[in-house]
């Protein structure tokens, strides 16, 4: 019961987290114009990963998409990539975890398979959450760097006569949404991994099976092997991996640096 609750809660928390990551990625307010210690402008600037917007005090808002790909800063491209990787991994994780849920019965899927799927989705959620947190943190770092650079030359004078308002940008709502969502996805992933341990069938290495025969013959079966109860007429023996650990080809690969180019 506790395992089902942990798995279910992990799924719901991850679902909320991934929805948050998607929302943060789509939001326009990744960076907003800093209004502190600044002239009161009748224009408010804010920027997202995909477009920049200007809201006038008249209420009119105009947004322009970044129609260039090569002209964009490498850091922005990296953040985009991290967020997309996070969303993709999270979406796959959600799909896998649906089938892994203990409360959902699919055919005659055994607990070991569900345990493996739960672990897979858990790891996917963890990586997804880390991608989102990394993406948001990279963007935040970029903002902090630019903020202090623009503060250094807050007003650029032309012969000391004409002043130019230097627009400084600070953290937008999307950053906080991203951090929280990434954290939730991470927590959800950890919960799925914990649930996986409880789902895995705990079997002893050697099981003695006694038969009430006339003689004292006792048949034993090596605990390392188990008759398959999979789909179809497969009667071959499969190796049982204790604790639901996975084979090499099941291990989740992390995105390489080349994903961000």
């Amino acid at each position: 019961m506790a395992v089902t609750a942990c798995q279910g809660l992990g799924f719901v928390v991850s679902l909320i987290g991934i929805a948050g990551i998607i929302a943060a990625t789509c939001m326009d307010q990744w960076s907003t114009q800093d209004l502190y210690n600044n002239p009161v402008t009748a224009v408010f600037n804010y920027q997202g990963l995909w477009r920049s917007c200007v809201r006038e005090s008249s209420g009119f808002t105009e947004c322009r998409g970044y129609f260039t790909l090569l002209g964009l800063p490498a850091m922005l491209q990296a953040v985009r990539a991290l967020m997309i990787v996070g969303i993709v991994l999270g979406a796959i994780g959600l799909l896998v975890s649906i089938f892994a849920l203990k409360c959902i019965r699919i055919g005659s899927m055994e607990d070991s398979a569900k345990a493996n799927m739960t672990l897979t989705s858990g790891i996917m959620f963890i990586v997804s959450g880390l991608c989102a947190i990394a993406g948001v943190s990279v963007f935040a770092n970029m903002l902090v760097t630019n903020f202090w650079m623009s503060t250094a030359n807050m007003y650029t004078g032309m012969g000391g006569m004409v002043q130019t308002v230097q627009t400084r940008y600070t953290f937008g709502a999307a950053l906080f949404v991203g951090w929280v969502a990434g954290g939730l996805t991470l927590i959800g992933g950890v919960m799925m991994c914990i649930a996986c341990r409880g789902l895995a069938p705990e079997e002893t290495n050697y099981k003695a099976v006694s038969y009430h025969a006339s003689g004292h013959s006792v048949a034993y079966k090596p605990g390392g092997f188990k008759a398959s109860t999979g789909f179809g007429s497969n009667t071959k023996n499969k190796k049982i991996y204790d604790g639901g650990a996975r084979t090499e080809d099941e291990v989740q690969s992390y995105p390489s640096k080349h994903d961000y180019v």
């Epitope: 114009q33 009161v40 402008t41 600037n45 917007c53 200007v54 008249s58 209420g59 130019t164």
Partner: antibody, heavy 118, light 113 residues
């Protein structure tokens, strides 16, 4: 068509109060930023106050801050300017205007005259 | 506060003539976010409220004749009337619409010779 009609102006003694009204019609008043602008007897234009959409922000000219209050009644499509502690330099023709693209005042009323004199 | 300086204070012209008036701001009115200049031009005829001519320094308001053209960027702006007509005789004001307070220039009075 768009119409802005100001009222409430008149002669008032220094230190006195006055409430100006601006009845709007012909446009979506509740989703428009509105401003008060005054024109001095010397014909100088002076922006007085602005109220943005949804009561979010109000902005005032420094010399009227704390004395004037801009407000709106979206149900009745009316903009107000409550003026108190009036001074002789507040004497002017007061216009209410709608802010449009570029924060420009795209529609103006005919104005209401305010005279502060003892 | 941003100081708007208009020149000349008055202009005497003949009908059909090309007229240029200047407006300078003490601070740049260019917004980096959309690369637009928040400068507005108004026309005021005697006994009437001001009328919007040009916003964003160069965008003509609907219904405004094509002979009115706004130009400039940053701190220096110009209003040009390609061929003055009798109905254009008025006072022209420029306004900063970028930073509060939204200051106006003293105006340029257009008079007929």
């Amino acid at each position: 068509q768009v119409m802005l009609v100001e009222s409430g102006g008149g002669l008032v003694k220094p230190g006195g109060s006055l409430k100006l009204s601006c009845a709007a019609s012909g446009f979506a008043f509740s989703s428009s930023a509105m401003s008060w602008i005054r024109q001095t007897p010397e014909k100088r234009l002076e922006w007085v106050a602005t109220m943005t959409v949804g009561y979010i922000y109000t902005y005032y000219l420094d010399t009227v801050k704390g004395r004037f209050i801009i407000s709106r009644d979206n149900a009745n499509n009316t903009l107000y300017l409550q003026m108190s502690s009036l001074r002789s330099e507040d004497s002017a023709m007061y216009y209410c205007a709608r802010q449009g693209y570029g924060n420009a005042m795209d529609y103006w009323g005919q104005g209401t005259s305010v005279t502060v004199s003892s | 506060d941003i100081v708007m300086t208009q020149s000349p204070s008055s202009l005497t012209v003949t009908a059909g003539e090309k007229v240029t008036m200047s407006c300078k701001s003490s601070q740049s009115l260019l917004n980096s976010g959309n690369q637009k200049n928040y400068l507005t031009w108004y026309q005021q005829k005697p006994g009437q409220p001001p009328k919007l001519l040009i916003y964003w320094a160069s965008t003509r308001e609907s219904g405004v004749p094509y002979r009115f053209t706004g130009s400039g960027s940053g701190t220096d702006f110009t209003l040009t009337i390609s061929s003055v007509e009798a109905e254009d005789l008025a006072v022209y004001y420029c306004q900063n619409n970028y930073i509060y307070p939204l200051t106006f220039g003293a105006g340029t009075k257009l008079e007929l010779k």
